[in-house]
């Protein structure tokens, strides 16, 4: 891949990014796993979904997530005076009507039931990483990525471009 980018000041512009079009440009059903090949699983508990990061038993079926890709335009610089460039944003839905959301106050990743149009908290900038990995940066909190903490998904602040290769924010997407 192109190698991972940095974040920092530039990503303040993500707040002002605009999703081009209401419908996704494409969709992809995939299993989501960590850099260390642990699976991201979703369990219905007390009428709400919990998200886990765990080792699956042999032949245990992986949970799938529907990634919906959106083309997004972002301002050319921090002042936002003009447009330059395109980004790919995604929403992630493990089951009908439920989407991953960034809860920036709690630094957590949650599954919320909601209707379209989806709130900004459900959108993540998709980064094409080295070693066939991706990372997910919050649209609502630039420089903050979905990561793994204590066998759960959490929001992790990445404070410099050198730290973007940190394994706990790297994920693998697979059709199997």
């Amino acid at each position: 891949a192109f190698g991972i980018s940095g974040v920092q000041k530039y990503t303040r512009a993500l707040h002002d990014s605009s999703i081009t079009g209401i419908s996704p440009i494409t969709e992809y059903l995939a299993s989501l796993s960590t850099y260390n090949d642990q699976s991201i699983t979703f369990a219905l508990e007390d009428e709400s979904y919990e998200i886990y990061v765990e080792d699956l038993k042999k032949d245990e079926k992986k949970d799938k997530v529907l990634l919906s890709y959106y083309e997004s335009q972002h301002p050319s610089n921090e002042s936002g005076d003009g447009v330059d460039g395109k980004m790919l944003m995604v929403t992630l839905s493990p089951t009908k009507d439920f989407w991953l959301h960034a809860n920036n106050k709690e630094h957590s990743v949650e599954l919320h039931k909601c209707e379209k149009p989806l709130p900004d908290q459900a959108f993540f900038v998709l980064h094409n990483m080295h070693s066939n990995c991706v990372s997910f940066e919050c649209k609502t909190d630039p420089g903050v990525f979905i990561g793994v903490k204590d066998n759960h998904l959490a929001l992790i602040k990445v404070d410099s471009s050198e730290n973007l290769c940190t394994e706990n924010i790297l994920f693998k997407l697979s059709e199997t």
Epitope: I4, Y10, S76, N77, G85, M87, L126, L164
Partner: antibody, heavy 119, light 111 residues
Framework: EVQLVESGGGLVQPGGSLRLSCAAS????????MSWVRQAPGKGLEWVAT????????DYVDSVKGRFTISRDNSKNTLYLQMNSLRAEDTAVYYC????????????WGQGTLVTVSS | EIVLTQSPATLSLSPGERATLSCRAS??????????LNWFQQKPGQPPRLLIF???NRGSGVPARFSGSGSGTDFTLTISSLEPEDFAVYYC?????????FGQGTKVEIK
């Protein structure tokens, strides 16, 4: 305005060395993966090398591995290509390119600098 | 290495006509459900300019007459009605894997 300006090209003898520079402006340099792409006179485009925003990863086309080194100085907003053991077939216009935010494609290109390897 | 083959090598058309350019990959350029195939335009003495990314999405400031389609290994760039400024060389490029490769180019010339 996003701008990439290459410099350092010129005439060099086979076996010689040259260092190309690319000065970036109008964006937060360290947030983007950068690459070099070359074009021999009258020919098509060839990707040469890429470096990640945080300098963690580099990749090269096989034909330049061990001879060329891509690097960057994020404090100076500058990309470099150190070219050693130059050959006639390295003669080309060398373009500095910036990936889009997220690193999916080459989005911004400089005007290029011509490197001529000849005795 | 993924080899990209463009056809035709040269396309001779008049302004107002429709141009259809083809790019075929030696293997699929799909990754993460995306077709990582991009199109660039290059005019003499100028650097390439991004037209289309991920097979079908226009770059910033690219006119609507340019459109891309295709998936897997077969891709098409269409210019619905050629303007005088569209006569140039067009390259496809894959960003699925290193080494990133380009097609040999299609020259669209005035008939």
């Amino acid at each position: 305005e996003v701008q990439l300006v290459e410099s350092g090209g010129g005439l060099v003898q086979p076996g010689g060395s040259l260092r190309l520079s690319c000065a970036a402006s109008g964006f937060t340099f360290s947030s983007f993966s950068m690459s070099w792409v070359r074009q021999a006179p009258g020919k098509g485009l060839e990707w040469v090398a890429t470096i990640s925003g945080g300098k963690t990863f580099t990749d090269y086309v096989d034909s330049v591995k061990g001879r060329f080194t891509i690097s960057r100085d994020n404090s100076k907003n500058t990309l470099y290509l150190q070219m050693n053991s130059l050959r006639a077939e390295d003669t080309a216009v060398y373009y500095c390119t910036r990936a889009n935010y997220g690193n999916w494609f080459f989005e911004v290109w400089g005007q290029g600098t011509l490197v001529t390897v000849s005795s | 290495e993924i080899v990209l083959t463009q056809s035709p090598a040269t396309l001779s058309l008049s302004p107002g006509e429709r141009a259809t350019l083809s790019c075929r990959a030696s293997e699929s350029v799909a990754k993460y459900g995306l077709s990582l195939l991009n199109w660039f335009q290059q005019k003499p003495g100028q650097p390439p300019r991004l037209l289309i990314f991920a097979a079908s999405n226009r770059g910033s400031g690219v006119p609507a007459r340019f459109s891309g389609s295709g998936s897997g290994t077969d891709f098409t760039l269409t210019i619905s009605s050629l303007e005088p400024e569209d006569f140039a060389v067009y390259y496809c490029q894959q960003s699925k894997e290193v080494p990133f490769t380009f097609g040999q180019g299609t020259k669209v010339e005035i008939k």
